[in-house]
Interface confidence: low
């Protein structure tokens, strides 16, 4: 004869938090370590699963195709229920009936998703939304890969993503002193550097590189380099290109300068020679397929020229230099140095020898050019 379950047989309710799409195991233990009859029911008393003889039977609940039990643990008195591919609506109070006692487990299923694509351009906003069961009042705390902490309720917003926000975000959802952790991979689409400066002597080949701060399985889009030469009144498009499956193909390129572009990533441009008329700054933009907005990288070119004309030795630089940079002319192995925080420096009647023109920032040499000054012999007066 089956004994009725009294109120005192009802054990204290446990709370278990689950993640949408994950698997959860709700435990139920009998006092005797042996195989015995058990049933799992939902709060509406609908049977989900149980034992019939030595077999697992399933009831008419909507969980039937996703619920299971570890048969191997039955003879140890463990009658857990495993629910696969959790849904928010699986949140409920589940009752395990075993040995004339009831164990109640409250399951709360949460989901955390990004409102938009998880591949976002630098400067765009990221919103994470928490899906939760009715009646719950969870709190969310997220930590970015760069160590930024953000707290919220059902939504968490990051107004302007930065490069360092790329990576795995760890979000902790708390409810009833219990926590569940979500990991969301965010890819911030940006160049590795916002800006770079290339320093070259006149005539040298110039290499511009634009490495990306992310990798995508399929990278498709189009780009352009606009250039504002220091000497020019307006900017002009130097090159336009397409990107398909990480492959670069040039669409249009100016005749002067005739830039060359590498076919593979990272984006790589070669200017055959650095000339004063090319010194200036450029903006490389990259528009990615199916993304609104563009990636930007600024690039600067500083060109140095050292010349000797009659009795004047001159060193000049063109391009965007900061006012704190020093330009110097220095005779090798001698103390003689002329320095200025300017874009040109000169020496009248320079001594013969190897002169060095140096562009430096707080003692660190950014660019140097050597020029040999040969002795000039006075012309003899004809009788």
């Amino acid at each position: 004869e089956q004994k009725l379950i009294s109120e005192e047989d009802l054990a204290a309710k446990k709370v278990v938090l689950g993640k949408k799409g994950d698997t959860v195991e709700l435990t139920c233990n009998a006092s005797q370590k042996k195989n015995t009859q058990f049933h799992w029911k939902n709060s509406n008393q609908i049977k989900i699963l149980g034992i019939q003889g030595l077999f697992l039977t399933k009831g008419p609940s909507k969980l039937s195709d996703r619920a299971d039990s570890r048969k191997s643990l039955w003879d140890q008195g463990c009658f857990s229920m495993i629910i696969k591919n959790l849904k928010i609506e699986d949140s409920d109070t589940y009752i395990c009936e075993v040995e004339n006692k009831k164990e109640e487990v409250e399951l709360l299923v949460f989901g955390l998703t990004a409102n938009s694509d998880t591949h976002l351009l630098e400067g765009q906003s990221l919103t994470l939304t928490l899906e939760s069961p009715p009646g719950s009042s969870p709190s969310v705390k997220c930590r970015s890969p760069g160590g930024k902490n953000i707290q919220g309720g059902r939504t968490i917003s990051v107004p302007q993503l930065e490069r360092q926000d790329s990576g795995t975000w760890t979000c902790t959802v708390s409810q009833d002193q219990k926590t569940v952790e979500f990991k969301i991979d965010i890819v911030v689409l940006a160049f590795q550097k916002a800006s770079s400066t290339v320093y070259k002597k006149e005539g040298e080949q110039v290499e511009f590189s634009f490495p990306l701060a992310f990798t995508l399985e399929k990278l498709t889009g189009s780009g352009e380099l606009w250039w504002q030469a220091e000497r020019a009144s307006s900017s002009k498009s130097w090159i336009t290109f397409d990107l398909k499956n990480k492959e670069v193909s040039v669409k249009r390129v100016t005749q002067d300068p005739k830039l060359q572009m590498g076919k593979k990533l990272p984006l790589h441009l070669t200017l055959p020679q650095a000339l004063p008329q090319y010194a200036g700054s450029g903006n490389l933009t990259l528009a990615l397929e199916a993304k609104t907005g563009k990636l930007h990288q600024e690039v600067n070119l500083v060109v140095m020229r050292a010349t000797q004309f009659q009795e004047n030795l001159t060193c000049e630089v063109w391009g965007p230099t900061s006012p704190k940079l020093t330009l110097s002319l220095k005779l090798e192995n001698k103390g003689a140095t002329v320095s200025k925080q300017a874009k040109a420096v000169w020496v009248l009647n320079p001594e013969a020898g190897m002169w060095q023109c140096l562009l430096s920032d707080s003692g660190q040499v950014l660019l140097e050019s050597n020029i040999k000054v040969v002795p000039t012999w006075p012309t003899p007066v004809q009788p």
Epitope: T215, K218, N245, K263, K264
Partner: antibody, heavy 122, light 107 residues
Framework: QVQLVQSGAEVKKPGASVKVSCKVS????????MHWVRQAPGKGLEWMGI????????IYAEKFQGRVTVTEDTSTDTAYMELSSLRFDDTAVYYC???????????????WGKGTTVTVSS | ETTLTQSPAFMSATPGDKVNISCKAS??????VNWYQQKPGEAAIFIIQ???TLVPGIPPRFSGSGYGTDFTLTINNIESEDAAYYFC?????????FGQGTKLEIK
């Protein structure tokens, strides 16, 4: 001109693993993408995966995920494809193919190896 | 995953004939189709890139056409050395997929 020379035929038992090699000449391996493709008797070609040395990315076809491992030994310019937990239906000719010509997309398969026959038999 | 349906599976031709091999994609793949020729015991040879462009060194009797979902490899004025297995490949997206192949026999 890039050339690919593959290892010789192999006979394996079900459950075992096989490692097929592909030696590159005429170019350095670090500058080439390497695809792996197979063809079972009487069947069409099946793309298995690619190794992209530029970012070390490996992309596998879902069907082979977890069973195939693609590696490279840059010191010998040799690429390897290892397939584990072999089944009878893994009996096939396995090919390596690369984007070996600068004029084409990096992910093209413009140069192919002659193939390595792998037979799975008990 | 894009399925490429290649037809016919087998065909026979006489020297001087013109043949067409079809490759149909289950979704739009722009012009991202390459064609290859393979002879027994030999490595596959790249013959057509981006659906229509002949690979340098391949005889001009080979040509390709199509865009989107329907692609064709045409061989004009067939020669006995053209007897081989021909297959198409889509490289629009991963996983790359191949047509089932066409075996061309020369009588």
């Amino acid at each position: 001109q890039v050339q690919l020379v593959q290892s010789g035929a192999e006979v394996k038992k079900p459950g075992a693993s096989v490692k097929v090699s592909c030696k590159v000449s005429g170019h350095t391996l670090t500058e080439l993408s390497m695809h792996w493709v197979r063809q079972a008797p009487g069947k069409g070609l099946e793309w298995m995966g690619i190794f992209d040395p530029r970012d070390g990315q490996i992309i596998y076809a879902e069907k082979f995920q977890g069973r195939v491992t693609v590696t490279e030994d840059t010191s010998t310019d040799t690429a390897y494809m290892e397939l584990s937990s072999l089944r009878f239906d893994d009996t096939a000719v396995y090919y390596c193919a690369t984007g070996g010509n600068e004029d084409y997309y990096f992910y093209y398969m413009d140069v192919w190896g002659k193939g390595t026959t792998v037979t799975v038999s008990s | 995953e894009t399925t490429l349906t290649q037809s016919p599976a087998f065909m026979s031709a006489t020297p001087g004939d013109k043949v067409n091999i079809s490759c149909k994609a289950s979704q739009d793949i722009d012009d991202d189709v390459n064609w290859y020729q393979q002879k027994p015991g030999e490595a596959a040879i790249f013959i057509i890139q981006e659906a229509t462009t002949l690979v340098p060194g391949i005889p001009p009797r080979f040509s390709g056409s199509g865009y989107g979902t329907d692609f064709t490899l045409t061989i004009n004025n067939i020669e006995s050395e053209d007897a081989a297995y021909y297959f198409c490949l889509q490289h629009d997206h991963f996983p790359y997929t191949f047509g089932q192949g066409t075996k061309l026999e020369i009588k």
